[in-house]
């Protein structure tokens, strides 16, 4: 995919630097495995510089391809209580709106650890609306070294 | 956070780059939990190009947004290692120096599991000197594959 | 290391932006212990933009020093089904060919867990080919949001 | 070429300590972990403790813990075990060995060892 | 702990023959961490094979070892005089190491 003439030459900012890291604000309400972040300087090191957030969830404003990272850490949790549960906790990360483009993007399970930690590059779109869904009977940590989200334009 | 008409000007160069990629040198005496550093070409593939190391610790050149990445392998673990001994091998990164900057920054312990890896976007400032503690009683190994340290400045 | 004045000059396309997101195709035959990987929008979310596939190895287009990341599912597993299996299950990512180059990059083996992730930056050259090579009797996952190995050219 | 010579050894009652001592040689003493390894005698062998390179992190087989202590004094190149509470069943040949430099648990130098005989 | 069980015991073998000794583990450990070493008597151990088929510096190619998971093998291709001693497996992939028995190869 090459730049346009038009990109080429516009200031480096316009062609992307769009970034966030959120911290853990809460989980959802029964029946919503969703976790709500927050973000900003007074929060601490969290920030949304480009992306914004949209009733606790990350929207993207800039069309490129991101790499999105996570790490979710369990708040009450030894290795024996993440396989002790009947249903194993699971962290999905996906676009959940617009319904459309809805789909998977990474997807972890507590096996016999209290942390997951992944990355991917995938490509996103304005408007797309990144989702993390916690699902377990397992509460997720908000300390804000154990549990976070960001997302970091990379290209076009 | 807008680059100014100067910043725009600038060869590509001077808006940053800094990055780093370290292989362990050692671990701490009696009393220090911190894994020391060491990178360059004569010792493989690890490098530094903009941080420098300081008595076998990162410290950061230029302010800007960073990508923290880090991986830790225990040089000998198991499903039992880590809940056989009484005080479970944690790892955690943050600023040490200054002490007014001081946090943690990614804390992940090894639950079950002889390997962490995990990865964070983080505002970073001129003399932040980031120090990476591991605490409990597992040797890390010193396998260049195995376990590294490193950062990524992604933008101002 | 600089950037010579002609690389100032030219779009910013020109410094690289080589990014690649592959997808599992399939392991490979016996006694070769590979994962073959493929891309394209057709597939869904993968993608190459520099780097080639050959035989469903990555292959490196561009110098420079890249983020390499990777995760890797085991389809059927428990967290006992990790340590009950006589072969323990290890993933090495290395460059591979040219001979002269192969070298192991990074290093993880499945513990107590069944996803293994992580990231690090390193050299890479024109030519290099990267194999992830998947030692033991468990088979990874193909969905895509479980098993996905990709590099980020980051600088020169 | 890479020696280690143990020393400290001898005739112990139960309840009584000991010191021993691996003075290290021909290669650079700080940068390895190093640990002790017994054998019984007509036995096979047994990991007792580990000591770090620099020194900050230590550990020790469940058998001995509490009652065992790994030092290290790079320095002087030297590794000690301080034995108290010694039991009958410590009885052994204990060998200083050093670690691969990856710190894995597998030892690519072996002492001679010194025999511990700890009886009434 | 991990187990590690060898067998036979003692192994009785001429010069020139081939010698296989076995090291079985009770459960399985990471990437064969498996490591072999050699005793004489009145000897300290001597490292001779590590991760499982790594030959350590200074041993000859006769040996050679093998296997993954909890079943090893070191097998001497063409016995020597100096080769019959005491062979002690040892695992160090899980917290604590341990060693096997050993198994003890006698001339016949």
């Known amino acids: 995919q090459r730049l346009s003439r038009a990109q080429q030459q516009l200031p480096l900012e316009s062609l992307g630097w769009d970034i966030a890291e959120l911290q853990l604000n809460h989980t959802g309400p029964q029946q919503d495995p969703r976790l709500y972040w927050q973000g900003g300087p007074a929060l601490g090191r969290s920030f949304l510089r480009g992306p914004e957030l949209d009733k606790g969830q990350l929207r993207i404003r800039r069309d490129g391809i991101y790499m999105v990272h996570i790490q979710v850490t369990l708040a009450i949790c030894s290795s024996t209580s993440t396989s002790r549960h009947h249903h194993p906790t699971t962290l999905a990360v996906g676009i959940c709106s617009p319904a459309s483009r809805s789909i998977s993007l990474l997807r972890l399970s507590f096996h016999q650890g209290c942390t997951i930690a992944s990355q991917r590059l995938t490509p996103l779109a304005r408007g797309d609306t990144l989702c993390t869904n916690l699902t377990g009977t397992l509460l997720p940590s908000r300390n804000t070294d154990e549990t976070f989200f960001g997302v970091q334009w990379v290209r076009p | 956070q807008r680059l100014s008409r100067a910043q725009q000007q600038l060869p590509l160069e001077s808006l940053g780059w800094d990055i780093a990629e370290l292989q362990l040198n050692h671990t701490g005496p009696q009393q220090d939990p911190r894994l020391y550093w060491q990178g360059g070409p004569a010792l493989g593939r690890s490098f530094l190009r903009g941080p420098e190391l300081d008595k076998g610790q990162l410290r950061i050149r230029r302010d800007g947004i960073y990508m923290v990445h880090i991986q830790v392998t225990l040089a000998i673990c198991s499903s039992t290692s880590t809940s056989r001994h009484h005080h479970p091998t944690t790892l955690a990164v943050g600023i040490c120096s200054p002490a007014s900057r001081s946090i943690s920054l990614l804390r992940l312990s090894f639950h079950q599991g002889c390997t962490i890896a995990s990865q964070r976007l983080t505002p970073l400032a001129r003399g932040d000197t980031l120090c990476t503690n591991l605490t409990g009683t597992l040797l890390p190994s010193r396998n260049t594959d195995e376990t590294f340290f490193g950062v990524q400045w992604v933008r101002p | 290391q600089r950037l010579s004045r002609a690389q100032q000059q030219l779009p910013l396309e020109s410094l690289g932006w080589d990014i690649a997101e592959l997808q599992l195709n399939h392991t490979g035959p016996q006694q070769d212990p590979r994962l073959y990987w493929q891309g394209g929008p057709a597939l869904g979310r993968s993608f190459l933009r520099g780097p080639e596939l050959d035989k469903g190895q990555l292959r490196i287009r561009r110098d420079g020093i890249y983020m390499v990341h990777i995760q890797v599912t085991l389809a059927i597993c428990s967290s006992t089904s990790t340590s009950r299996h006589h072969h323990p299950t290890t993933l090495a990512v290395g460059i591979c060919s040219p001979a002269s180059r192969s070298i192991s990059l990074l290093r993880l083996s499945f513990h107590q867990g069944c996803t293994i992730a992580s990231q690090r930056l390193t050299p890479l050259a024109r030519g290099d080919t990267l194999c992830t090579n998947l030692t033991g009797t468990l088979l990874p996952s193909r969905n895509t949001d479980e098993t996905f190995f990709g590099v980020q050219w980051v600088r020169p | 070429e890479v020696q280690l010579l143990e020393s400290g050894g001898g005739l112990v009652q139960p309840g009584g300590s000991l010191r021993l001592s691996c003075a290290a040689s021909g290669f650079t003493f700080s940068s390895y972990a190093m640990s002790w390894v017994r054998q019984a005698p007509g036995k096979g062998l047994e990991w007792v403790s580990v000591?770090?390179?620099?020194?900050?992190?230590?550990d020790y087989a469940d058998s001995v813990k509490g009652r065992f202590t790994i030092s290290r004094d790079n320095s002087k190149n030297t590794l000690y075990l301080q034995m108290n509470s010694l039991r009958a069943e410590d009885t052994a040949v204990y060998y200083c060995?050093?670690?691969?430099?990856?710190?894995?648990?597998?030892?690519?130098?072996w002492g001679q060892g010194t025999l511990v005989t700890v009886s009434s | 702990e991990i187990v590690l069980t060898q067998s036979p015991g003692t192994l009785s073998l001429s010069p020139g023959e081939r010698a296989t000794l076995s090291c079985r583990a009770s459960q399985s450990f990471s990437s064969n961490y498996l490591a072999w070493y050699q005793q004489k008597p009145g000897q300290a151990p001597r490292l001779f094979i590590y991760?499982?088929?790594s030959r350590a510096t200074g041993i000859p190619d006769r040996f050679s070892g093998s296997g993954s998971g909890t079943d090893f093998t070191l097998t001497i291709s063409r016995l020597e005089p100096e080769d019959f001693a005491v062979y002690f497996c040892q695992q160090y992939g899980i917290s604590p190491c341990s060693f096997g028995q050993g198994t003890k190869l006698e001339i016949k």
């Open positions: 060995a050093r670690h691969d430099y990856s710190n894995r648990y597998y030892f690519d130098y």
């Open positions: 991760g499982a088929s």
């Open positions: 000591i770090s390179d620099s020194g900050g992190t230590t």
